[in-house]
C-alpha cells in the first residue's frame, strides 16, 4: 500500500525547490526498480516528484491565500513489468499559512452620528478588520483592536471593534471627531501586521441649549398713525442648538396696556413686534413690555435645561405724527326759515388740534355762494333763501391748521331750510271752458283744482270763491268741493253767442296758512252753438273748438 | 451577493485586440481564495476556458490562447480586463466572465455574457 | 489537457420522466474537481453541482451528482418543465475544461 504522511508546504517560500514530502509504495525495496509518477492539478507546473524516490517538491511560491490546497494523484509503475505496483491515488498538498497579510478594513470609509451628552458606554459603530491569513493557523489572524486617536471621548473593545463613548461630549463645542482605529494580528505578540482605519464620528444635536436674548433692552418706535398689525421692530434670542432644537416661540411677559404683540418669524427665529391697538401720542408716548422666549420642541427628559425662559424688555417710543384738526362731531344739521335776510346765523361748527401745540384753526365752505364762515366756524347765509328753491343744502367744510395748512380735515353739514307761507294756491293747469248757447241753469260747466308751492305743515287746504264782482252779477256760480276741488255752474238758463260770445271769470283761492293767502284766478268760458244733443256746432274759435275735440262745420 | 457584469465593444477588425472589462460589484475582487475568469462560447458551441486572474496579479491561461491573451486586474476599479490580439472570424462569441473558487475550480457566478463578433 | 465526453448529445423526455446525463474523463480527476452547469437559451450557464456531488445553493434536489474518477453522472429525478436545457460539466484537474454539453428537450 502507499505510504505517506499529510503533506504541507509553507506558503511564500522563495527557494527553488522545497521539499514537501515523500510517498513510496511499501512494496518498495530501494532497488529503484519503482516508477512513481504525479498527475492532476499543478503537477508538472507547482509540484514535481522524483521518480525514483517518490521525494515531492514545490517549484513554485506558493500563496495560501490564493490556493490553499492542492489536489494530485500519485501511480507508481513497475519499471520491469510496466504494470501499476499501487492502485492510482488521490492526496492533498495543503499550503500552510505564514502571517504575511495585515488587517484591512473593507468597510471603508466609516462614519458614525451619535447624539451628543451620550452617557458613557453608548455605542457608537463597530468596525471590522479582515486578515486574509488562515484564521486556524496560529494567531495569524487574530485581531486586537486599539485606539490611536480619539481620547479620552472614545474607547474600542479590543477583541469585537466595538467603538463606545467614554466620556461626555458637547456638540455646541466640538460636532466631530476623528477616531483611528487600529486592528493589529498576533493578538499583537510581537511580529503583528498591523492596518489602521479613520472613522469620523458626528455629535447630532439634542435640545440642551434655551434660547437667550443677548440683548436685555430694546428700543422701538412706533407712529402714532401706524394701523393695528403694523410690525414695529424685531427682537432675536439665540439658540446654541441647530435645526428644530433651535426653533423657538417669542410671546410677551407683561403688557398692561395690551397694545402690542409678538409673533415669531420661524424662517429667521426672530420676534416681530406687532401693533395690536392704535396708539396716541397725545394719550400715551411710551411703552414698557417684556418679551420671553422659549423653544418649540422641548422633550420632557431635557426639561432641566429649560426651566426659566429668557427674557427681555422692549421700550417702545410713540412718535408724534402732525394729525389734522379734529371736529366735534362727524357732521352737523342745522336749520333756517325761508326769507330770512343776508348774514342771518345758521350755525356754529367746532374743530381742534389734537396735537399738543393746539394750532389755530381757519373754516372754509367749499364751493357756496349762498352761506359763509368765520374763523369761529359760525356759519351765516349771504343771501335770502327760499324753500321752494331749494329745501337742503349739502355743505363741505373743511377745517385748516394755521401752522399747517397741509393738515385738513373736512365734514359734511346739512342746512334745512324752513317753510313759511309765502305762496298763496293758483290753478293746478290752465282751464279753458264752455258753454252751449241752451245751457239751462246748474249746468257742470268746469271742475277745477288748486295747489301751493309751500310745503305743508300738516295739510294743504284751499278754498274757492267769486270775486265779488262776478258774484253779484255772474252768469255762472261755484260750489267748493272740500276737498281742494271745486265746480263751476251755470247761473241761468240761455247764453247768446252774438252777444257774449267769451265769459272771464275770476276765482279767489285761499291757503289754511297763517297767515291766510289768496290769489285770483281767471277762468275763460267760451259761449258755443250746439244742437238739441248738446253737440257743439259753432264757436267764436274754431281753432279751440278743434283743439278740445269739437267738430266744426 | 457578488454579481459580474461584461463591457466592451460587440464589433472588432480582424487582426484588431479584443477588450472586454468585468466589473465586480457585491463583493471586493482583493479577496482571497478566488479566481477572475474568462470563458467564452462560440455560437451554437460550447464553452470554453480563456484564462484567470488572482487579485495580486497572478495569471493563468488555456494553453491554446496563451500566446494571444492578457488578462489584467484594476483592484481600486474593482474590475478585471480580457485582451485578446490578432483576432479572426473564429473568435466570434459570446465572452463570460465569472469567479473562480481557487480550490476547487468551479465558476459560480457567471456574468451575462457580451457577443462579440469579428468582421471587417 | 483532461477531456471531457458528455452522452448522449441530446436527451429527448417528457417533463416527470428521470433524465441520466454521463460525462466522461480522459485521465482520472478527482471528485473535488468536477462540476455541473445549466445553460437556457440566451442566458450565462448556472452551477448546479460541485465536488461531484454537492449542490449548489437555491438547486432544488431534484438534481443529484455522482461518480469518482473517469465517470461522473448528473440525474435529475424528475423532470420540470425549467429543467429542459443544456447541460455542461467541467473538470479542474489540470487546465480547466468543459464537456461539450448535453441538450435535454422535450419529448
Known amino acids: 500500500g502507499w505510504v505517506w504522511n499529510q503533506f504541507f508546504v509553507p506558503e511564500e517560500m522563495n527557494t527553488t525547490s522545497h521539499h514537501v514530502g515523500r510517498l513510496r509504495s511499501d512494496l518498495d525495496n530501494g532497488n529503484n526498480s519503482f516508477q512513481y509518477k504525479l498527475l492532476g492539478a499543478g503537477a508538472g507546473s507547482t509540484f514535481i516528484i522524483d521518480e525514483r524516490t517518490g521525494d515531492i517538491y514545490a517549484i513554485e511560491k506558493l500563496d495560501r491565500e490564493e490556493r490553499s490546497l492542492y489536489i494530485l494523484r500519485a501511480q507508481v509503475i513497475d519499471i520491469t513489468t510496466g504494470r501499476a505496483v499501487e492502485p492510482e491515488s488521490e492526496f492533498v498538498i495543503k499550503v500552510s499559512d505564514i502571517n504575511d497579510n495585515e488587517p484591512k478594513f473593507l468597510d471603508e470609509p466609516y462614519e458614525a452620528i451619535v447624539p451628543e451628552m451620550s452617557p458613557e458606554g453608548t455605542l457608537v459603530i463597530q468596525v471590522t478588520a479582515s486578515d486574509a491569513d488562515d484564521p486556524s493557523s496560529g494567531n495569524n489572524a487574530r485581531l486586537l483592536y486599539s485606539l490611536l486617536q480619539g481620547q479620552p471621548y472614545f474607547s474600542v473593545e479590543p477583541t469585537t471593534g466595538v467603538i463606545r463613548i467614554s466620556s461626555k461630549m458637547d456638540r455646541e463645542l466640538q460636532d466631530e471627531y476623528w477616531v483611528i482605529i487600529q486592528a493589529k494580528d498576533m493578538i499583537g505578540q510581537p511580529g503583528a501586521l498591523s492596518g489602521t482605519t479613520s472613522v469620523l464620528i458626528k455629535l447630532s444635536d439634542v435640545n440642551d441649549n434655551k434660547p437667550i436674548f443677548k440683548e436685555s433692552l430694546y428700543r422701538l418706535t412706533v407712529s402714532e398713525s401706524a394701523p393695528t398689525g403694523t410690525s414695529i421692530g424685531t427682537i432675536m434670542a439665540y439658540d446654541n442648538d441647530i435645526g428644530e432644537n433651535a426653533e423657538m416661540d417669542y410671546s410677551i411677559e407683561e403688557d398692561d396696556s395690551q397694545t402690542f404683540d409678538i409673533i415669531t418669524n420661524h424662517e429667521t427665529q426672530e420676534g416681530i413686534v406687532i401693533l395690536k391697538k392704535k396708539v396716541n401720542f397725545e394719550h400715551q408716548n411710551h411703552y414698557g413690555i417684556r418679551a420671553k422666549v422659549k423653544n418649540h420642541h422641548v422633550d420632557e427628559q431635557l426639561m432641566k435645561y429649560h426651566t426659566e425662559a429668557s427674557t427681555t424688555f422692549i421700550k417702545i417710543q410713540v412718535e408724534d405724527v402732525d394729525e389734522p384738526p379734529l371736529f366735534l362731531l362727524p357732521y352737523y344739521i342745522f336749520e333756517i326759515f325761508e326769507e330770512t335776510p343776508q348774514g342771518s346765523f345758521v350755525g356754529v361748527v367746532s374743530a381742534t388740534d389734537p396735537d399738543n401745540r393746539k394750532s389755530p384753526i381757519r373754516y372754509s365752505i367749499t364751493r357756496s355762494k349762498v352761506f359763509n364762515i368765520d374763523d369761529n366756524g359760525t356759519i351765516t347765509t349771504t343771501n335770502s333763501l327760499d324753500r321752494e328753491i331749494s329745501a337742503w343744502y349739502n355743505l363741505s367744510i373743511t377745517a385748516t391748521e394755521k401752522y399747517n395748512i397741509e393738515q385738513i380735515s373736512s365734514i359734511p353739514v346739512y342746512v334745512q331750510v324752513l317753510n313759511i307761507n309765502d305762496h298763496a294756491p293758483e290753478f293746478s293747469q290752465y282751464y279753458e271752458s264752455y258753454v252751449c248757447e241752451n245751457a239751462g241753469s246748474g249746468q257742470v260747466i268746469q271742475t277745477i283744482s288748486a295747489v301751493d308751492r309751500d310745503e305743508s305743515i300738516e295739510e294743504h287746504h284751499f278754498y274757492f270763491n267769486l270775486s265779488v264782482e262776478d258774484t253779484n252779477s255772474s252768469s255762472f256760480t261755484i260750489i267748493d268741493n272740500q276737498d281742494n276741488t271745486a265746480v263751476i255752474l251755470t247761473n241761468r238758463t240761455g247764453f247768446n253767442l252774438q252777444e257774449e260770445p267769451i265769459f272771464y271769470i275770476s276765482i279767489l283761492i285761499a291757503d289754511n296758512g297763517i297767515p291766510s293767502l289768496t290769489s285770483t284766478n281767471t277762468l275763460t268760458i267760451h259761449v258755443c252753438d250746439c244742437d238739441d244733443s248738446g253737440s257743439t256746432q259753432t264757436c267764436q274759435y274754431q281753432e279751440l273748438m278743434l283743439s278740445m275735440g269739437f267738430k266744426t262745420e | 451577493q457578488v454579481q459580474l457584469q461584461e463591457s466592451g465593444p460587440g464589433l472588432v477588425k480582424p487582426s484588431q485586440t479584443l477588450s472586454l472589462t468585468c466589473t465586480v460589484s457585491?463583493?471586493?475582487?482583493?479577496?482571497?481564495?478566488?479566481?477572475w475568469s474568462w470563458i467564452r462560447q462560440h455560437p451554437g458551441k460550447g464553452l470554453e476556458w480563456i484564462g484567470y486572474i488572482y487579485y495580486r496579479g497572478r495569471t493563468y491561461y488555456n494553453p491554446s490562447l496563451k500566446s494571444r491573451v492578457t488578462i489584467s486586474v484594476d483592484t481600486s476599479k474593482n474590475q478585471f480586463s480580457l485582451k485578446l490580439s490578432s483576432v479572426t472570424a473564429a473568435d466570434t462569441a459570446v465572452y463570460y466572465c465569472a469567479r473562480v473558487y481557487s480550490n476547487y475550480g468551479w465558476f459560480d457566478p457567471w456574468g451575462q455574457g457580451t457577443l462579440v463578433t469579428v468582421s471587417s | 489537457e483532461i477531456v471531457l465526453t458528455q452522452s448522449p448529445g441530446t436527451l429527448s423526455l417528457s417533463p416527470g420522466e428521470r433524465a441520466t446525463l454521463s460525462c466522461r474523463a480522459s485521465q482520472s480527476v478527482s471528485s473535488s474537481y468536477l462540476a455541473w452547469y445549466q445553460q437556457k437559451p440566451g442566458q450565462a450557464p448556472r452551477l448546479l453541482i460541485y465536488?461531484?456531488?454537492t449542490r449548489a445553493t437555491g438547486i432544488p434536489d431534484r438534481f443529484s451528482g455522482s461518480g469518482s474518477g473517469t465517470d461522473f453522472t448528473l440525474t435529475i429525478s424528475r423532470l420540470e418543465p425549467e429543467d429542459f436545457a443544456v447541460y455542461y460539466c467541467?473538470?479542474?484537474?489540470?487546465?480547466?475544461?468543459f464537456g461539450q454539453g448535453t441538450k435535454v428537450e422535450i419529448k
Open positions: 467541467q473538470q479542474y484537474g489540470s487546465s480547466p475544461s
Open positions: 465536488g461531484a456531488s
Open positions: 457585491g463583493g471586493s475582487i482583493s479577496s482571497g481564495g478566488y479566481y
